[in-house]
């Protein structure tokens, strides 16, 4: 909350309300929707961001082929239940008592059921594949320059430790960013790859979550990198459990 001190705003999360009634009269910022205090020196968890949002209203040789167990977020927005740390609860239910299990990035990983559905644990998403297509440019970007720029972006803008950016693949016009973070690798204070990916996704869509900062201006050697399509695949430590009906659909 010290990051919020100067003019009582939250640099890392515009979906907050800040007031000078924190400990010692310091600035304190609370997420819309949940009322939970957030640490403005780092990224806010995706679950709290989604809750706040709901309350505010080509096969290439070098590209990764998502595994058969990779999940895509097809369900879109919902008002999630977050745990005391602001993480997704393993079981999510809607207002009509339809329930489902989610992974640590809040993406559904089971068929929908009723209130009797059990989700024994929150399964960690340990591998995220961000698949981007950039707008046509005069020529291809230099791969190593692109790699360096994207790693810099995740390190500086999203505060993600460089070791969690596993690889950057490029075959014009497709860019793939691989984020990997096992439970054992994530230390206290480390930004979660799911949170970093969500901030990046919102930045790419021109919906930056950062307070007062300009939108994302991605440049490689001065050349603007403009993304026209984004697909994100999520791989969990335990494969998802969907019925055959869905798998064959």
């Amino acid at each position: 909350h010290t990051a919020a001190q100067d003019n009582c705003t939250c640099p890392t999360n515009k979906m907050t309300v800040c007031s000078p009634d924190g400990p010692g009269g310091r600035c304190q910022c609370r997420a819309l929707g949940s009322g939970m205090a957030v640490d403005c020196s780092t990224l806010t968890s995706k679950c709290l961001l989604l809750k706040a949002r709901m309350s505010a209203p080509k096969n290439a040789r070098t590209l990764v082929r998502p595994s058969e167990h990779a999940l895509v977020d097809n369900d879109g927005l919902y008002d999630p239940d977050c745990d005391p740390e602001g993480r997704f609860k393993a079981r999510q239910c809607n207002q009509t008592s339809v329930c489902w299990c989610v992974n640590s990035v809040g993406v559904r990983r089971t068929d929908k059921g009723d209130l009797s559905l059990r989700c024994d644990e929150l399964v960690r998403t340990h591998h995220i594949l961000i698949d981007l297509r950039h707008r046509p440019t005069a020529g291809a970007f230099n791969h190593s320059d692109l790699d360096a720029e994207l790693r810099r972006l995740f390190r500086e803008r999203y505060r993600l430790h460089p070791k969690f950016v596993a690889a950057v693949h490029y075959e014009q016009p497709t860019i793939q960013i691989e984020l990997r973070q096992n439970t054992s690798q994530k230390a206290a204070g480390d930004v979660d790859i799911g949170d970093a990916a969500y901030y990046f996704e919102r930045d790419i869509k021109g919906e930056s979550l950062f307070q007062g900062r300009g939108g994302l201006d991605l440049r490689v050697r001065g050349e603007p990198l403009q993304v026209e399509r984004t697909l994100i695949y999520y791989l969990d430590e335990i494969p998802p459990k969907f019925s055959m009906k869905r798998l064959t659909a």
Partner: antibody, heavy 116, light 111 residues
């Protein structure tokens, strides 16, 4: 000095609505949350919800959602709590307080009596 | 919702003696930096008065015989030397997440 002054006592019939006001002075009204708490006779404190006058943001206790409406008039530095579809169990003293949790200044309270 | 449970419900302590009131939250209300727990005193016919904010921060103007401690789920309000004017009902409240619930109250009397 900081002061929160609430409107006077009200007697209402079941099914009616009541609107309690809370006029703030001595601080920048738009910078702090205003919380609303009620206390039934001889009972403990119950949190209703809060409002941030600077943006009109509100939070509600699920128990009161749909029945309680919190609003604020920044030009008058006044917060309002309206409770509809009143029933006898809504008879209580209603307080406004400055702050989210750990309200440091409180209004004197407004007794709302619901009786047929 | 987070349930706040105070103990005891009522307490009788001799003047000058120590009074201790406990509050337990149904889940942790602390981060590594702060505990989102507050203590109030309420006398008959008056609004609650904030004594302690964020588990241990004494509010301005509150006598230093009042102190607060604890973290996680277990918190304590201590009055080191009870005075006659301390007779009141004491409430704990969390501000961890919506709704910001209160404990049921502890009535403190003179023995």
């Amino acid at each position: 000095q900081v002061q929160l002054v609430q409107s006077g006592a009200e007697v209402k019939k079941p099914g009616a609505s009541v609107k309690v006001s809370c006029k703030a002075s001595g601080y920048t009204f738009t910078n702090y949350w205003i919380g609303w708490v009620r206390q039934a006779p001889g009972q403990g404190l119950e949190w209703i919800g809060d409002i941030y006058p600077g943006g009109g943001y509100t939070n509600y206790n699920e128990k009161f959602k749909g029945r309680a409406t919190l609003t604020a008039d920044t030009s008058a530095s006044t917060a309002y709590m309206e409770l509809s579809s009143l029933r006898s169990e809504d008879t209580a003293v209603y307080y406004c307080a400055r702050g989210t949790g750990g309200g440091d200044y409180w209004g004197q309270g407004t007794l709302v009596t619901v009786s047929s | 919702d987070i349930v706040m449970t105070q103990s005891p419900d009522s307490l009788a302590v001799s003047l000058g003696e120590r009074a201790t009131i406990n509050c337990r939250a149904s889940q942790s209300v602390s981060t590594s930096s702060y505990s989102y727990m507050h203590w109030y005193q309420q006398k008959p016919g008056q609004p609650p008065k904030l004594l302690i904010k964020y588990a241990s921060n004494l509010e301005s103007g509150v006598p230093d015989r009042f102190s607060g401690s604890g973290s996680g789920t277990d918190f304590t309000l201590t009055i080191s030397s009870l005075q006659a004017e301390d007779v009141a009902v004491y409430y704990c409240q969390h501000s961890w997440e919506i709704p910001y619930t209160f404990g049921q109250g502890t009535k403190l009397e003179i023995k």
